[in-house]
């Protein structure tokens, strides 16, 4: 197992929609033509995989599990969005991906995203 | 309505190791992301581990990662609980549970899931 570099913002703040985005990078050593990206939360005492997905270079990502994530990819960048977040979904979302194919296997986790999601106040009752 | 039924518990010395198994009977096994918990006497049950639906994504609290190992079979309907490097405090009735959905983030919180089997007793003597 080999080490690689990945790069994630630090922070993102969630929609009003509960939807929050963000561009998880890897520094590639060589060619890669099978790359599995997984996402995992960490916060209130336990790391929970969000989602995962193997993927062929240039194909979509295709996620299981009634996955609340979507994404795509461009090269060495994966671009995610979680969505159905709510203020209590709020903490730490590492991104980890893996070079499965051809070998050398190569392995980076990100430092992490701190995303924050605030629930919407609700409407005021309107006379209109 | 699914039937849990855990076994698999029993008493063990410290740093020995435990597999417990959970058989379910019923509806579709394979829809549902399945969880363990733990009760220790006199506190609140808690989460121990959970694996979603096609096994892909696992969660586990902080106090058995790297110790305890959760998988599923879904042709036979079983969900396991590998425990390695037991310690006195994992002592507690290890309960297995389905939740209502193919997995969610809020796979560690109790209220996610339907059915609770009657759970199997661990004791890990010092």
């Known amino acids: 197992c080999k080490a690689m570099h990945v790069a994630q913002p630090a922070v993102v703040l969630a929609s009003s929609r509960g939807i929050a985005s963000f561009v998880c990078e890897y520094a590639s050593p060589g060619k890669a033509t099978e790359v599995r990206v997984t996402v995992l939360r960490q916060a209130d005492s336990q790391v929970t995989e969000v989602c995962a997905a193997t993927y062929m270079m240039g194909n979509e990502l295709t996620f299981l599990d009634d996955s609340i994530c979507t994404g795509t990819s461009s090269g060495n960048q994966v671009n995610l969005t979680i969505q159905g977040l709510r203020a209590m979904d709020t903490g730490l979302y590492i991104c980890k991906v893996e070079l499965m194919y051809p070998p050398p296997y190569y392995l980076g986790i990100g430092n992490g995203t701190q995303i924050y999601v605030i629930d919407p106040e609700p409407c005021p009752d309107s006379d209109f | 309505e699914v039937q849990l039924v855990e076994s698999g518990g029993g008493l063990v010395k410290a740093g020995d190791s435990l597999r417990l198994s959970c058989s379910a009977s019923?509806?579709?096994?394979?829809?549902?992301?399945m969880g363990w918990f733990r009760q220790a006497p006199g506190k609140e049950r808690e989460f121990v581990a959970s694996?979603?639906?096609?096994?892909?994504?696992?969660s586990s609290a902080d106090s058995v990662r790297g110790r305890f190992t959760i998988s599923r079979d879904n042709a036979k309907n079983t969900v396991y609980l590998q425990m390695n490097s037991l310690k006195p405090e994992d002592t507690a009735l290890y309960y297995c549970?389905?939740?209502?959905?193919?997995?969610?983030?809020?796979?560690?919180?109790?209220?996610?899931?339907?059915?609770w089997g009657q759970g199997t007793q661990v004791t890990v003597s010092s």
């Open positions: 549970a389905r939740n209502r959905r193919a997995w969610s983030l809020s796979v560690h919180t109790t209220r996610e899931y339907d059915d």
């Open positions: 019923g509806r579709t096994f394979a829809n549902n992301a």
């Open positions: 694996i979603s639906a096609s096994g892909t994504l696992t």
